[in-house]
């Protein structure tokens, strides 16, 4: 696809999130870069409004699984890469994230190129959270598990849908589940690639910047598409 050509090198990324969870309003700004050749993302996020009212791990899917255009699609899967094909005009990404036995986030993002920079602008609205629950009570560990994001085409909307379950580790050794329902639709009216069913395999590492005084998260992520085998024509080349 034409959009794929925009991802041949390292691309700067800017992320802006405005959120409200149970009336706690906050903003997050992020900067970094992505390299789709390796499916690699390196970003630093700062809460620009003080202390983040929710644990950082609960925002990872919104902040970086938001820029799935940096996923590495192997050669035999490139025709299934909706995300890059929607660029540079970009896509709208909407999610409902339901935390088991707790509240839910609803998010809407616009992901697109502005000049040479890939920008992810997001609004997040969270409701029905327990004040002393795992999320508002900050009981999650500061780490992140590996996950698979399962993608299907949504021909009616000329986009895709994705479902996946995130497992957040809790300080007491248990797990907080977060069900994700995702929909992506192109912003432009050019042709996009509608994929066969497949998944993105994601690995994320969270860390801190020892010199940063503000509430922040440093994130390194690797994402690779999988789940579609080589066709017979590939095997006999």
């Amino acid at each position: 696809s034409k959009g794929e050509e925009l991802f041949t090198g390292v691309v700067p990324i800017l992320v802006e999130l405005d959120g409200d969870v149970n009336g706690h309003k906050f903003s997050v700004s992020g900067e970094g870069e992505g390299d789709a050749t390796y499916g690699k993302l390196t970003l630093k996020f700062i809460c620009t409004t003080g202390k983040l009212p929710v644990p950082w791990p609960t925002l990872v899917t919104t902040l970086t699984y938001g820029v799935q255009c940096f996923s590495r699609y192997p050669d035999h899967m490139k025709r299934h890469d909706f995300f890059k094909s929607a660029m540079p005009e970009g896509y709208v990404q909407e999610r409902t994230i339901s935390f088991k036995d707790d509240g839910n986030y609803k998010t809407r993002a616009e992901v697109k190129f502005e000049g040479d920079t890939l920008v992810n602008r997001i609004e997040l609205k969270g409701i029905d959270f327990k004040e002393d629950g795992n999320i508002l009570g900050h009981k999650l560990e500061y780490n992140y598990n590996s996950h698979n994001v399962y993608i299907t085409a949504d021909k009616q909307k000329n986009g895709i849908k994705a479902n996946f379950k995130i497992r957040h580790n809790i300080e007491d050794g248990s797990v907080q589940l977060a069900d994700h329902y995702q929909q992506n639709t192109p912003i432009g009216d050019g042709p996009v690639l509608l994929p066969d069913n497949h998944y993105l395999s994601t690995q994320s590492a969270l860390s801190k910047d020892p010199n940063e005084k503000r509430d922040h998260m440093v994130l390194l992520e690797f994402v690779t598409a999988a789940g579609i085998t080589h066709g017979m024509d590939e095997l006999y080349k």
Partner: nanobody, 126 residues
Framework: QVQLVESGGGLVQTGDSLRLSCAAS????????MGWFRQAPGKEREAVAT????????YYDDSVKGRFTISRDNAANTVYLQMNSLKPEDTAVYYC???????????????????WGQGTQVTVSS
Amino acid sequence: QVQLVESGGGLVQTGDSLRLSCAASLRTFKSYAMGWFRQAPGKEREAVATISAEGDSTYYDDSVKGRFTISRDNAANTVYLQMNSLKPEDTAVYYCAASRFPYGLRLLQRRESDYWGQGTQVTVSS
């Protein structure tokens, strides 16, 4: 051509009420968050109130909480600002704004919008 047209401004006394209206020529009005902003002479434009696309979330600046009420009529493509107990410090040009981001948070926190109206003058004399 998208237009936001404000009306309802005027000159009133301290303690009086006014109702501002903003008519939007947006085909998908019900998917836009809407907001009211104001700008007093020599000051920056500030957010007064915002309302989500579905009308289920509203945000107010602390200075107007309890006095101003924002509402919308998606059938009429119109957003309203009911202003009660007006004070001289409410004197400003009031602008209507529309944002594709549906919860009104981007409007409120970044003061960024897709469309702006031309404004309507509100003057509160003591």
